[in-house]
Interface confidence: low
């Protein structure tokens, strides 16, 4: 067994006894008598461990010695202290001229701190003034043994430690012994030496171990509101460091024209809440904590915290809603230290519209409600960003009103999947809700591992995506790597003092929003023959579905006139149009689209042009004139041939040069190359000559042509 | 009590065509994505294709893409795998499945095709 | 795609004995999405876990799975004559869906 007497957050009796005596002459703490020990054999008080040490009266001794001992009735061994006196047995040696008639008493109280780095013992002297005039000194010894299984004796002469008490004020010292936190579960065994005017007091061994004799911080943070549903909500949050849960004891008043309640109570949860609340009060509140789950001391109180109700309470006192939503007020409302009856009171909106009593409900004597129902947006009134909601009187409205804030939430979130298929990008605009001061808006998201569900729904498990600010006003997200079939359901989070709102769910599968890449390979021709405007395109790598295409074609200039043409073959690679002017120059644009319908066009192609070439024949030679000039008696005669350029329309779409055809009946058939030229001069000699002029281009000669014949006579032709 | 029964299974030459189906009951089919998974003989699992609850959505493994096509009624609460020139390499029990993610919580007890010449 | 990779691919056991079977994927499976599966011969195959951790209703608790990014493992605590059978690991996360190459459990 070990020698040395327990130390508990429970009190124990130090008697200090004359040689010789019995148990029964032994001197119980005041108030307690020998029989009103607890279960387990030590002396019980319910606020707080005091370690009280009681000496006889010292009547008719000249020297005495006595023996201090802590004693409980199942425990008659005393522990003695071995010190530096050759390890003696202590004895308190009491000149009988100086303390003659005095009980010698101690009030000791032990604890760890909260911090959990000091043991703090606090000798406290009932001696009262009497040391005054004495050199009073308070020495606390102790010792952590290592393993003190292994050592039930008492530790030896020379392994105790001191450490000085300080006495500020000579009733009160202070003992520091400092505790590794490694050694806090350990035991450690002190014991206290008090010497004052020669004379030396010592108590016997005591044994502890500092983690069941914690005294915490106290509670830190203590605040009270007023709860949506009426009650006052006493909160706090425990002081940092304590290794385990604590207790805690609620000490509250409440003070007003009509009742004064005071309360006590014990609670785990670092809140309380205290009902049927009143108007015009005052609640004055205080709160102390202790271990939880085994020994421990309480900690000091609080400071105390007033908290002054309204004469008129409304809860909740403000209200963020969304479009289409109910919410309810309540009210208690007090007007000259009387109560108003629940029945008489009315409510108002903006102290312009009265709230029909439809809307109301007598939840108890003095608790009004009113309900708003499938709320519309709050539209605001000069700088106020809500409705204010008045609980009156029949007669008259206090200055003090309930907040409510409506919110159209309905915000369009758009997606749209790159043509690599690599990422996706949500774009989402504030701009048709009211904003609300002191807000943030927060795009959430929950990605399924397959599609959407039919209808969505906000999902308890999110992840905030960041989003950032464009020049547009627009705010825009971008999920990579993305999951195509995955279904992401997004919804925006208005996050605000009073609550938080979101914007109805929206679920997006990238597979379903893509906007392909362009078509590429773009090319435009006019078809040498056939005459169309052939239009090639290849289609996007991604996405693998098929895709429908939109061609957009027009005469190259400054402002084109589109013309549409749409194919639906998800195989086709080109397509031939019939267009107007052959000879012109063609822009040409091709964008695609998944057939189904689903996601985005692509952006247009880069325009394709095509080029002015011959595509056929010319249509025609040209119109020409002649002039003939000779005279008219020779047989010989000049003749001039004239004519116009053909034109684009005729040449299909160019003529490289004209060629002239002759013919006689002697002669024959020959053919002139006069190039490009448009006037050609020959000589008639023959009594019949045709000519014929033919346009030739990179394709041919011209099929439809126009014939001159020239016989005699003839005169000059203007 | 879930329930996907299946049917159309059968030996098939090479080239030809065949189509399973694959009745489904005890729960909200209108609500599920449906799978077709199939098993060569002695071999492991192979996903097929699958169709979204309401069939907007229909992928298809790229072993069968293009011959293959998944369908769905579900006025009559029955999926379907149209399969078109087949290979004997298409050989296999194959199942539909029910998920609601993408694992696959309810199985049809599986139909052999045997695509032989 | 993402190619799963079980092991061992034959694991002998006897009837009380602890069976951890592993699945290796070649890249992340992103949140998890990771399903176990147990085939008998001639039947259909069963959904033991998904979420790479989560049981169904009516699957036994002796059937637990962990892991996360490209390890998983199934395990099962003590082996019961009735837990001879193949097991699949498949992957959801990803298009294509893809399952591993199986673990077949024989009795030593």
């Known amino acids: 067994f070990n020698l040395s007497y327990p130390i508990t957050p429970w009190r124990f009796k130090l008697s200090c006894m004359p040689p010789n005596s019995t148990y029964d002459y032994f001197l119980l703490p005041a108030g307690l008598s020998k029989n009103t020990s607890n279960s387990n054999g030590h002396y019980e008080t319910a606020v707080e461990p005091k370690f009280n040490s009681s000496g006889t009266h010292f009547s008719n001794l000249s020297k005495t010695t006595f023996h201090c001992c802590f004693r409980s009735e199942q425990d008659r061994n005393c522990s003695l202290c071995a010190d530096n006196i050759e390890g003696k047995t202590f004895v308190s040696t009491v000149n009988s001229l100086v303390f003659q008639q005095i009980d010698a008493n101690w009030n000791i109280q032990c604890w760890l701190k909260g911090d959990l780095k000091l043991f703090i013992c606090y000798v406290e002297s009932l001696f009262k003034n009497l040391f005054r005039n004495y050199n009073y000194k308070v020495h606390l010894l102790y010792v952590l043994p290592e393993v003190l299984e292994d050592s039930p004796l008492v530790p030896q002469k020379g392994s105790f430690q001191m450490v000085h008490c300080n006495c500020s004020v000579h009733e009160c010292c202070e003992c520091l012994v400092p505790v590794p936190t490694a050694k806090l579960n350990d035991t450690l065994l002190m014991c206290l030496k008090i010497t004052s005017g020669g004379v030396i007091f010592q108590s016997p061994l005591m044994s502890v171990q500092p983690i069941n004799m914690v005294k915490p911080d106290p509670p830190l943070g203590l605040h009270m509101e007023i709860t949506d549903d009426g009650n006052l909500k006493i909160s706090w949050s425990s002081p940092p460091l304590v290794p385990f849960p604590l207790q805690y004891q609620v000490k509250y008043s409440e003070n007003s024209t009509t009742v004064i309640r005071e309360a006590d109570k014990i609670v785990s949860a670092t809140s309380l809440l205290v009902d049927s609340i009143l108007p015009g009060s005052s609640y004055e509140v205080q709160v102390r904590g202790k271990r939880l789950d085994g020994p421990g001391i309480w900690s000091d109180w609080s400071t105390p915290r007033v908290f002054t109700t309204q004469d008129v309470i409304y809860f909740p006192p403000k209200i963020l809603t969304s479009v289409g939503s109910n919410v309810s007020f309540h009210c208690i409302y007090k007007k000259e230290n009387k109560i108003v009856p629940s029945k008489e009171i009315v409510w108002w909106m903006n102290l312009a519209e009265k709230i029909p009593q439809s809307q109301y409900d007598v939840v108890s004597d003095h608790v009004s409600k009113v309900t708003f129902f499938n709320l519309n947006e709050t539209k605001p009134r000069g700088k106020f960003t809500y409705d204010a909601v008045y609980c009156c009187n029949e007669h008259e409205c206090h200055h003090r009103y309930a907040e409510l804030y409506v919110i159209d939430v309905n915000i369009n979130i758009s997606c749209e999947t790159d043509g690599y298929l690599t990422k996706m990008t949500c774009r989402w605009s504030t701009s048709t809700i009211q904003s609300l001061a002191e807000s943030t808006l927060q795009l959430r998201y929950h990605r399924s591992s397959l599609y959407c569900s039919d209808i969505p729904s906000i999902h308890p498990i999110s992840e905030p995506k960041d989003c950032y600010l464009q020049s547009d006003g627009f705010y825009e997200c971008i999920f990579q790597p993305i999951f195509l079939l995955s279904g992401y359901t997004m919804w925006i989070r208005i996050n605000h003092s009073l609550g938080s709102l979101d914007s109805p769910p929206t679920c997006v599968l990238p597979d379903s929003v893509v906007k392909p890449l362009p078509p590429s390979s773009v090319k435009a021709e006019i078809t040498i023959n056939i005459g169309l405007l052939k239009i090639s395109w290849e289609k996007p790598v991604f996405p693998e579905n098929n895709l429908q295409f939109q061609i957009r074609y027009g005469l190259s200039g400054k402002e084109v006139q589109w013309k549409m043409y749409e194919v639906y073959d998800a195989k086709s690679k080109s397509v031939s149009l019939p267009v107007p002017d052959l000879c012109a120059v063609y822009a040409v644009q091709v964008r695609c689209k998944r057939l189904d319908g689903l996601g985005y066009w692509s952006n247009w192609s880069n325009p394709a042009y095509t080029v002015v070439m011959d595509i056929k024949v010319p249509m025609r030679g040209p119109e020409f004139w002649r002039i003939i000039n000779g005279d008219t008696m020779k047989k010989e005669k000049n003749v001039t041939l004239l004519w116009k350029p053909l034109m684009k329309n005729d040449s299909l779409c160019s003529v490289q040069r004209y060629v002239i055809n002759h013919h006689t009946s002697c002669n024959g058939t020959w053919s002139e190359d006069v190039g490009n030229h448009t006037k050609f001069t020959f000589l008639w000699t023959e009594q019949a000559h045709t000519v014929t002029v033919l346009a030739i281009n990179s394709i041919g000669a011209s099929v439809a042509n126009f014939n001159l014949t020239f016989s005699w006579p003839m005169s000059k032709v203007n | 009590q879930v329930q996907l029964l299946q049917s159309g299974g059968g030996v098939v030459q090479p080239g030809r065509s065949l189509r399973l189906s694959c009745a489904a009951s005890?729960?909200?089919?209108?609500?599920?994505?449906m799978h077709w998974v199939r098993q060569a003989p002695g071999k492991g699992l192979e996903w097929v294709a699958v169709?979204?609850?309401?069939?907007?959505?229909?992928y298809y493994a790229d072993s069968v893409k293009g011959r293959f096509t998944i369908s769905r009624d579900n006025s009559k609460n029955t999926l379907y795998l149209q399969m078109n020139s087949l290979r004997a390499e298409d050989t296999a029990v194959y199942y539909c499945a029910g998920v609601r993610e993408n694992y696959f919580s309810y199985w049809g007890q599986g139909t052999l095709v045997t695509v032989s010449s | 795609e993402i190619v799963l990779t079980q092991s061992p691919g034959t694991l002998s056991l006897s009837p009380g004995e602890r069976a951890t079977l592993s699945c290796r994927a070649s890249?992340?499976?992103?949140?998890?999405?990771l399903a176990w599966y147990q085939q008998k011969p001639g039947q259909a195959p069963r959904l033991l876990i998904y979420g790479a951790s989560s049981r169904p209703t009516g699957i036994p608790d002796r059937f637990s799975g962990s892991g996360s990014g490209t390890d998983f493992t199934l395990t099962i605590s003590r082996l019961e004559p009735e837990d001879f059978a193949v097991y699949y690991c498949q992957q959801y996360a990803a298009s294509p869906l893809t399952f591993g190459g199986g673990t077949k459990l024989e009795i030593k």
């Open positions: 890249q992340s499976v992103s949140s998890n999405y």
């Open positions: 005890g729960f909200t089919f209108s609500s599920y994505g």
């Open positions: 169709i979204s609850y309401d069939g907007s959505n229909k």
